[in-house]
Interface confidence: medium
C-alpha cells in the first residue's frame, strides 16, 4: 500500500469561451481508495478555490460554469490525489480560456451541383456556424475547412475556406458520389469534429476541366 501516483491534467476545452472543462489522468492508486480534488486560483490572486463542479464533465473532470469562467484571466490549477498513505499533486497548469476553445461542428451543411448556362458547372457548399458560438460580439473569428472525396476513394481532399461560410469547387469526377464535410475552429483554439457527411451525386455530364 502506497501513496497515490502523480495525477496529470491533460486537457481543457471550452465550446464557446463562456464555460470550460478540464480533465485529469489519475496516477497509480497505491492499492487504496483515492480522492481527487482540483484547486485553482486566477493569475494575480492568492485565494485558492476548489473545483465548482465535478459532475458535468464526467469522471476525473472539473467543469467551470458561466459564473466561474472569465476569458480575461489565466487560471492556474492543480489536482491533488489523496489516500490513507499520503498525497501527491499534479504539475500546475496555466489555462487561458481564449486558447482552449473547441467549438461544435458547423451546422446545416448543404451541397448542390450548380450548372449555370454561361459558365462551367461547379459544386456549391454552404453551412452555418455552430449555435453555441456568438459571432456578433466580435470575440470570435471562426475559420472553416471543407473536405471531400469520391465515396470509394481512400484520401480526402481538404480546402481551407477562411471565414466564409460557402465554397465553390470545380473539376469533380462526373458520375461519382462525393462525401462532403466541414469543420471549424476559432482563430486561437482547436478544430471541431467534422460535421456529419453529406453525399452528393455528380451528374455524368459534369465538365471535368476548367
Amino acid at each position: 500500500q502506497l501513496p497515490p501516483g502523480k495525477p496529470e491534467i491533460f486537457k481543457c476545452r471550452s465550446p464557446n469561451k463562456e464555460t470550460f472543462t478540464c480533465w485529469w489522468r489519475p496516477g497509480t492508486d497505491g492499492g487504496l481508495p483515492t480522492n481527487y480534488s482540483l484547486t485553482y486560483h486566477r493569475e494575480g490572486e492568492t485565494l485558492m478555490h476548489e473545483c465548482p463542479d465535478y459532475i458535468t464533465g464526467g469522471p476525473n473532470s472539473c467543469h467551470f460554469g458561466k459564473q466561474y469562467t472569465s476569458m480575461w484571466r489565466t487560471y492556474i490549477m492543480m489536482v491533488n490525489a489523496t489516500n490513507q498513505m499520503g498525497s501527491s499533486f499534479s504539475d500546475e497548469l496555466y489555462v487561458d480560456v481564449t486558447y482552449i476553445v473547441q467549438p461544435d461542428p458547423p451546422l446545416e451543411l448543404a451541397v448542390e451541383v450548380k450548372q449555370p448556362e454561361d459558365r462551367k458547372p461547379y459544386l456549391w457548399i454552404k453551412w452555418s456556424p455552430p449555435t453555441l458560438i456568438d459571432l456578433k460580439t466580435g470575440w470570435f473569428t471562426l475559420l472553416y475547412e471543407i473536405r471531400l472525396k469520391p465515396e470509394k476513394a481512400a484520401e480526402w481532399e481538404i480546402h481551407f475556406a477562411g471565414q466564409q461560410t460557402e465554397f465553390k469547387i470545380l473539376s469533380l469526377h462526373p458520375g461519382q458520389k462525393y462525401l462532403v464535410q466541414v469543420r471549424c475552429k476559432p482563430d486561437h483554439g482547436y478544430w471541431s469534429a467534422w460535421s456529419p457527411a453529406t453525399f452528393i451525386q455528380i451528374p455524368s455530364d459534369f465538365t471535368m476541366n476548367d
Epitope: 481532399e157 481551407f160 471565414q163 466564409q164 476548367d210
Partner: antibody, heavy 118, light 111 residues
C-alpha cells in the same frame, strides 16, 4: 481576355509607405478572390495577402501582418495593397493574381517593382 | 517552421521525362491540403500549370501531370521541350501559418 495590371511601385525609404493598385479587366471582378504575391530579386515566390470577393474576408502572411492592408473597389475593378512601415526585405516584384476555386491563382499580372532602400 | 522543399535545379534532354518533387509536412501537404503548381518562364509572371494535385487548366499540354502522396507532391514533364525551361513552384495552404506556402522553386534546364 483576363488582364491584371499592377501599378504604384517605385523607390521608397525604410519606414515609408506605398500603395499598389491592380486594375482588372476581362472578367467579373466582383465574383473572385484576389491575391498579392511577391518575389524578391533572384528569389522565389512569397504569398502576401488575399481578399474575398465582397471584401468580407482577408488573410495576411505573418511577415506583413499589421503593416500591409489589402482592399478592393469592385465598382472600379481594382485591387489595392497599402504598404506601411516598409523594410528593406519588402523589396520585390509584387504580383496580383485572381483566385479561383480552392483560391488557386489562375491569372497573374506582370508585376510592379517595389524597392526599399535608404 | 513550415516549408515546402523543392530541389533547386533539375535538367533533362529534349524528349526525356523529368520529375520535380515538393516535400511538405503534416501542416500542409500531409494535412490533406491540395497542391498547385506554377510555371514561371524567364522574365515573365507565373502561370498556373497544375491545380488541386493533378488537374490541368485548359491550354496546358498533357505532357504535364501532377500527383500527391502523403506529405509530398510531384510534377512530371514528359517529352521535354526547350520551351519548358523555366522555374517551377509548388504551393499549398498551411494550417500552422494560416497562409499560402510556396516551395523554393526548381530551375529546370533543358540540355
Amino acid at each position: 481576355e483576363v488582364q491584371l495590371l499592377e501599378s504604384g511601385g517605385g523607390l521608397v525609404q525604410p519606414g515609408g509607405s506605398l500603395r499598389l493598385s491592380c486594375a482588372a479587366s476581362g472578367f467579373t471582378f466582383s465574383s473572385y478572390w484576389m491575391h498579392w504575391v511577391r518575389q524578391a530579386p533572384g528569389k522565389g515566390l512569397e504569398w502576401v495577402s488575399d481578399i474575398s470577393s465582397a471584401s468580407s474576408y482577408t488573410n495576411y502572411a505573418d511577415s506583413v501582418k499589421g503593416r500591409f492592408t489589402i482592399s478592393r473597389d469592385n465598382s472600379k475593378n481594382t485591387l489595392y495593397l497599402q504598404m506601411n512601415s516598409l523594410r528593406a526585405e519588402d523589396t520585390a516584384v509584387y504580383y496580383c493574381a485572381r483566385g479561383l476555386d480552392a483560391r488557386r491563382m489562375d491569372y497573374w499580372g506582370q508585376g510592379t517593382l517595389v524597392t526599399v532602400t535608404s | 517552421q513550415s516549408v515546402l522543399t523543392q530541389p533547386p535545379s533539375a535538367s533533362g534532354t529534349p524528349g526525356q521525362r523529368v520529375t520535380i518533387s515538393c516535400t511538405g509536412s503534416s501542416s500542409n501537404i500531409g494535412y490533406g491540403y491540395v497542391v498547385h503548381w506554377y510555371q514561371q518562364l524567364p522574365g515573365t509572371a507565373p502561370k498556373l500549370l497544375i491545380y488541386r494535385n493533378n488537374q490541368r487548366p485548359s491550354g496546358v499540354p498533357d505532357r504535364f501531370s501532377g500527383s500527391k502522396s502523403g506529405t509530398s507532391a510531384s510534377l512530371a514533364i514528359s517529352g521535354l521541350r526547350s520551351e519548358d525551361e523555366a522555374d517551377y513552384y509548388c504551393a499549398a495552404w498551411d494550417d500552422s501559418l494560416n497562409g499560402w506556402l510556396f516551395g523554393g522553386g526548381t530551375k529546370l534546364t533543358v540540355l
